[in-house]
């Protein structure tokens, strides 16, 4: 309904978002040195974290190294930081990919094994591949509710895309409820054709697209959005180049008067909702 | 001032106990680890074992097992438990603070004496 007399003025948006959903989590744990799982229930203030502008994340796999505090550690084993004298370590030397400052002393780390003594949170993060399958791999039964309110100032009109009556224990669909503001975050996947479990390992970035076509004339008024979806992470991205979406947090706490704190490497899902479209009027 | 003073030592048998203790004053005692050293007659100071602020533990090969190095960052305090005592066991024991991110001691204690001789 493109009409060349119309006066077209692109949408000023905002954006809230809920998500919800519970996540039972096997975790591996090591008692009096015997390998064991437990399990753990996981809420939303568990898996979301905030984030500014229209972005929320969900968590879909994690690494954790518990019980570190500041002191002196052998570095984690790799080709850059293993040594056989102290000549192998530079006192003071901070190396951009290291996790500490080198003391200068090459110790053992395990059996014979020997790695430069840095100051760090120690133990050091040990570098290992994230869990196959994801722990949070029940995140695809998700749900999240976008909550869009739109307007076009020069037309003074406003809207949202949830109206009065919507029944909100709807979930998107394309063609079936094409107007439902709750999407399953599996759903999003599949209408990209990618598979939730296999981007939940290592992380993504999904763009939810709010479409506003809106014309704004008496007689043809119509102004609802139009939902769509796109991977914008690289999916063939090889290894070197970091693949996925992750960062690190920590939990700190205080144990024996000493501050101490859990590091967890993140990898997850960054949804970006992407609002754009425009109101014609004459 | 700072101040480290150990106490417990004194006469046992093999294969008896012995509990040492060190009491820190005048150091922020969360901030340092502590340490047990002993020197045998004629001999050179050597670590027995080794406790970081958080409780991060390390013993040399001989006490393995055998003795254990605790603290208590609330009371300013270490201990070393000692087990199945040996007579090679017998030596002065110091009690050392080092700064968490030092690698020598900064300050060490007197010294008590421990005899394991039947």
């Known amino acids: 309904s493109d009409k060349l007399y119309q006066r077209k003025e692109p949408v000023i948006s905002s954006v809230h978002t809920k998500v919800k959903g519970i996540a039972e989590v096997k975790e591996e744990i090591v008692e009096n040195g015997v390998k064991k799982l437990v399990h753990s229930v996981f809420d939303t203030a568990d898996y979301t974290f905030p984030l500014q502008g229209n972005s929320f994340f969900v968590m879909t796999n994690f690494l954790k190294t518990e019980g570190q505090e500041q002191r002196l550690c052998p570095e984690y084993p790799t080709r850059r930081t293993l040594c056989s004298s102290d000549r192998g370590c530079k006192k003071g030397w901070m190396d951009p990919q290291s996790k500490g400052i080198q003391t200068g002393r090459c110790v053992v780390y395990e059996g014979n094994q020997k790695t430069c003594e840095v100051s760090a949170w120690c133990p050091i993060e040990a570098v290992e591949e994230a869990p196959r399958p994801a722990l949070l791999n029940s995140a695809e039964n998700f749900t999240v509710l976008i909550k869009n309110n739109i307007d076009f100032p020069g037309h003074n009109y406003t809207t949202r895309n949830i109206l009065p009556g919507l029944n909100i224990t709807c979930t998107f669909h394309k063609t079936q409820n094409p107007q439902c503001p709750i999407f399953r975050l599996g759903d999003i996947f599949r209408e990209t054709g990618d598979n939730f479990s296999d981007v939940a390992i290592q992380g993504g970035i999904m763009g939810i697209e709010i479409y506003w076509d809106c014309n704004l004339d008496r007689w043809f008024h119509h102004c609802r959005p139009k939902y769509s979806f796109r991977r914008l992470d690289d999916k063939t991205t090889n290894v070197s180049l970091y693949p996925g979406y992750n960062f690190r947090y920590a939990k700190y706490y205080k144990e024996n008067n000493v501050e101490k704190r859990t590091l967890i490497k993140v990898f997850g899902i960054r949804f970006d909702i992407l609002v754009f479209g425009t109101g014609g009027k004459f | 001032e700072v101040q480290l003073v150990e106490s417990g030592g004194g006469l046992v048998q093999p294969g008896g106990s012995l509990t040492l203790s060190c009491a820190a004053s005048g150091i922020a005692f969360n901030y340092y680890s502590m340490s047990w050293h002993r020197q045998a007659p004629g001999k050179q100071r050597t670590l027995v074992a080794d406790?970081?602020?958080?409780?991060?533990?390390e013993y040399e090969d001989s006490v393995k097992g055998r003795f254990t190095i605790s603290r208590d960052n609330f009371k300013n305090t270490m201990t070393l438990h000692m087990n199945s005592l040996k007579p090679e066991d017998t030596a002065v024991y110091f009690c050392?603070?080092?700064?968490?991110?030092?690698?020598?001691?900064?300050?060490w204690g007197q010294g008590t004496q421990v005899t394991v001789s039947s």
């Open positions: 406790i970081s602020p958080g409780g991060h533990t």
């Open positions: 050392a603070a080092r700064l968490r991110f030092e690698v020598s001691s900064n300050y």
